[in-house]
């Protein structure tokens, strides 16, 4: 679960240890603030839950790729 350390900065202190199905993911954002202990990805699920994930993990990178492509593909 992401943790807001102040109004402007959200950090991740722990990462999920479960792979999340891309079908459950709606969006993501990158966490790079030097105020945070580590860089992270925060996935938002289709039910609006936010989950911290490790950007070094392949499934996380693949999920970001999937969401990037989905975002730029016009819905028909």
């Amino acid at each position: 679960q992401p943790d807001a350390i102040n109004a402007a900065v959200t950090c991740c202190y722990n990462f999920t240890n479960r792979k999340i199905s891309v079908q459950r993911l709606a969006s993501y954002r990158r966490i790079t603030s030097s105020k945070c202990p580590k860089e992270a990805v925060i996935f938002k699920t289709i039910v609006a839950k936010e989950i911290c994930a490790d950007p070094k993990q392949k499934w996380v990178q693949d999920s970001m790729d999937h969401l990037d492509k989905q975002t730029q593909t016009p819905k028909t």
């Epitope: 790079t32 202990p37 860089e39 070094k56 730029q72």
Partner: antibody, heavy 117, light 107 residues
Framework: QVQLVQSGAEVKKPGSSVKVSCKAS????????MHWVRQAPGQGLEWMGR????????KFDPKFQGRVTITADTSTSTAYMELSSLRSEDTAVYYC??????????WGQGTTVTVSS | DIQMTQSPSSLSASVGDRVTITCKAT??????LAWYQQKPGKAPKLLIH???SLEHGVPSRFSGSGSGTDYTLTISSLQPEDFATYYC?????????FGGGTKVEIK
Amino acid sequence: QVQLVQSGAEVKKPGSSVKVSCKASGLTISHTYMHWVRQAPGQGLEWMGRIDPDNHNTKFDPKFQGRVTITADTSTSTAYMELSSLRSEDTAVYYCARGVFGFFDHWGQGTTVTVSS
Amino acid sequence: DIQMTQSPSSLSASVGDRVTITCKATEDIYNRLAWYQQKPGKAPKLLIHGATSLEHGVPSRFSGSGSGTDYTLTISSLQPEDFATYYCQQFRSAPYTFGGGTKVEIK
């Protein structure tokens, strides 16, 4: 705050090797990737490669493959870049930078390497 | 490898001007684009990542836009400290590549 401090300027002979260090403070290097980027005099930026200090996995621009070695010591929070078989075209400022996503939000101050006979 | 073509290579502008720099990739980079500012003798400084996300502490006069293969950095009102060289960089896939740079000079 995050700081990357690099070793000092080097003058090298063609055919020799150079090893540049980059000591990090304010971050745990095993949580990120450490990259090396160079810039020849009056030229643009060129990505050389990166290391995941956690598992020592490396990735390089094929242009440098076989000539560059990137290592990291998590106990001292230091990354290293060694370039071998130096030629005059390797004269450049070498930067270390951090970034797990492939863009670089913190940079070292740069190390000037001059290759001259 | 993905090639990045940046234009113009240099431009002259005055304080208060609106400045636009463009960057074109040889394939779709899905908004994985960063912009940097570099001053002589200094390391580059990250301005924008993800095509539009302003880095912490970067003035709001800097903005990024674009999608697919075409991206733009805009400085809405040029300030004296903005005279520098600007680079785009794709982080869609390694090897990560930079544009050739745009030098913004005083008119």
